[in-house]
């Protein structure tokens, strides 16, 4: 999978007045990285292992960064036109991408009450625009206001993709988010399921990084994939993952099925608890 | 309009230790980070630390981690630095400062110059 | 700790004359550098944040630049009241450090 930084900011409006402050979140590979706390105006990393990709710096950059473009998003749902009364809200999700032939990505996109309504592609500075008319009219009164405001011009587009893939090679430069493998914790459990029926549910916890293997075998043979249920890997929080493999087996059999787990080199097997 | 009151001086005896106060008003006390900076004689500034007043986060330099223990009392809009142990080489002027932005301080008291001695 | 190395130690101007500090940091603190003066007897005033970034209510004499490891702070025209110490202080690592300070005097 290719190294990701992935910016996430939020402004609201009540009325048609634009609130004070702003919503950030940033994600390092697909991990909450960053968020900005509104109450004490810093950039706080997410977790011990965000604390250690910048070591002994104070998160200065991370905050101004964040301050401006939340500044700037207010600007932008400042010159949307229909607002109506009540809540609604503004987002901005920009992401850059380091991929393993080194080759970059970058792209921003903007939605208004939850809804999509302009991407662009940062390298050839490509928009593009859903089909539907209030996307359409949406999308038209945010890049006319981006095209007046000089510092929107071509070399600010340059500029957001040059930063975002600046800030992700310092922060892949630690070497935390590179070297680190933090091996899963795996637990089995067993829930009763219907008469004669168990469940049987194996969970991998706090590893990273995200790639891992998780199966049920019967007799040393891994079950086929209908008969098993997989959950998603999901960020945990503390820049880890877990995930989920369960299985519906007869019960008596238990000592026939082993849960199989593989990660980084690695793997396992996981007898059901009798 | 901000300010930050400190007392002018106090005088310590060496290992009795000492708290410092700077009693904010003008602005809203649970906002804004407060830095306290040491400044012996004739030399320049060390920053000792900072303390959120909403909820008591710190951050000190590590210099100063058995030396000074910050503390808020958001009733009174009341910073505290309290100076364990302290020796001669304890003797400076210290100062509470407000921050504007982050780690820029915009404010400043007018300094408390503490005498340790006998 | 990242150690900033002001100079000269002492400059002795005449009032009107334009001046400039130096401000050297250890390693490359981006532009988080902040300017500060104070003068006898008094608490330190924030003069310049973020190396140029200006202050409300600091005379537009004074003015930042610089960036990585080398920073400046010039007056374009001296004054009497601009007698003072001058410091720099980085924010982007800890702990927060100042420099030893520059004295202005005139001549």
């Known amino acids: 999978e290719p190294h990701s930084l992935r910016y996430n900011l939020t402004v609201l409006s009540w009325d048609g007045s634009v609130q004070s402050g702003f919503l950030a979140e940033v994600h390092l590979d697909g991990q909450p990285f960053l968020r900005y706390d509104r109450q004490k105006c810093r950039a706080k990393p997410q977790g011990q292992w965000a604390e250690d990709v910048l070591g002994n710096k104070t998160w200065d950059r991370e905050t101004r960064d964040l301050t401006g473009n939340g500044k700037d998003l207010r600007m932008t749902l400042a010159h949307i036109k229909d607002q109506k009364e009540g809540l609604h809200s503004l987002q901005e999700i920009r992401v850059c991408e380091i991929h393993e032939d080194n080759s970059t990505r970058s792209s921003q996109h903007f939605y208004y009450d939850g809804e999509l309504f302009l991407s662009q592609n940062l390298e050839t500075e490509e928009w593009t625009v859903p089909q539907s008319s209030r996307a359409q009219t949406l999308a038209m009164n945010v890049r006319n206001f981006l095209k007046e405001d000089a510092m929107k011009t071509k070399t600010h587009y340059h500029a957001m993709h040059a930063d975002c893939l600046q800030e992700l090679r310092r922060y892949l430069e630690s070497g935390v988010v590179l070297r680190r493998t933090v091996p899963p914790m795996v637990n089995v459990t067993r829930s009763e399921a219907s008469e004669g029926n168990i469940t049987v549910t194996c969970r991998a916890s706090s590893f990273y990084p995200r790639n891992i293997i998780l199966t049920w075998r019967q007799d040393g043979v891994s079950l086929s994939h209908d008969t098993q249920q997989w959950g998603d890997v999901l960020p945990d929080g503390n820049g880890t993952y877990q995930t989920w493999v369960a299985t519906r087996i007869c019960r008596g059999e238990e000592q026939r099925f082993t849960c199989y787990m593989e990660h980084s080199g690695n793997h396992s097997t996981h007898p059901v608890p009798s | 309009q901000v300010q930050l009151q400190q007392p002018g001086a106090e005088l310590v005896r060496p290992g009795a230790s000492v708290k410092l106060s700077c009693k904010a008003s003008g602005y809203s006390f649970t906002s804004y980070w407060m830095n306290w900076m040491k400044q012996r004689p004739g030399q320049g500034l060390e920053w000792i630390g900072m303390i959120h007043p909403s909820d008591s986060e710190t951050r000190l330099n590590q210099k100063f981690k058995d030396k000074a223990t910050l503390t808020v009392d958001k009733s009174s809009s009341t910073a505290y630095m309290q100076l364990n142990s302290p020796t001669s080489e304890d003797s400076a002027v210290y100062y509470c400062a407000r921050e504007m932005g982050p780690y820029t301080l915009d404010y400043w008291g007018q300094g408390t110059s503490v005498t340790v001695s006998s | 700790d990242i150690l900033l190395t002001q100079s000269p130690a002492i400059l002795s101007v005449s009032p009107g004359a334009r001046v400039s500090f130096s401000c050297r940091a250890s390693q490359n603190i981006d532009t988080s550098i902040h300017w500060y003066q104070q003068r006898t007897n008094g608490s330190p005033r924030l003069l310049i944040k973020y190396a140029s970034e200006s202050i409300s209510g600091i005379p537009s004499r004074f003015s930042g630049s610089g960036s990585g490891t080398d920073f400046t702070l010039s007056i374009n025209s001296v004054e009497s009241e601009d007698i003072a110490d001058y410091y720099c202080?980085?924010?982007?690592?800890?702990?927060?450090?100042f420099g030893a300070g520059t004295k202005l005097e005139l001549k």
């Open positions: 202080q980085q924010s982007n690592y800890w702990p927060l450090t």
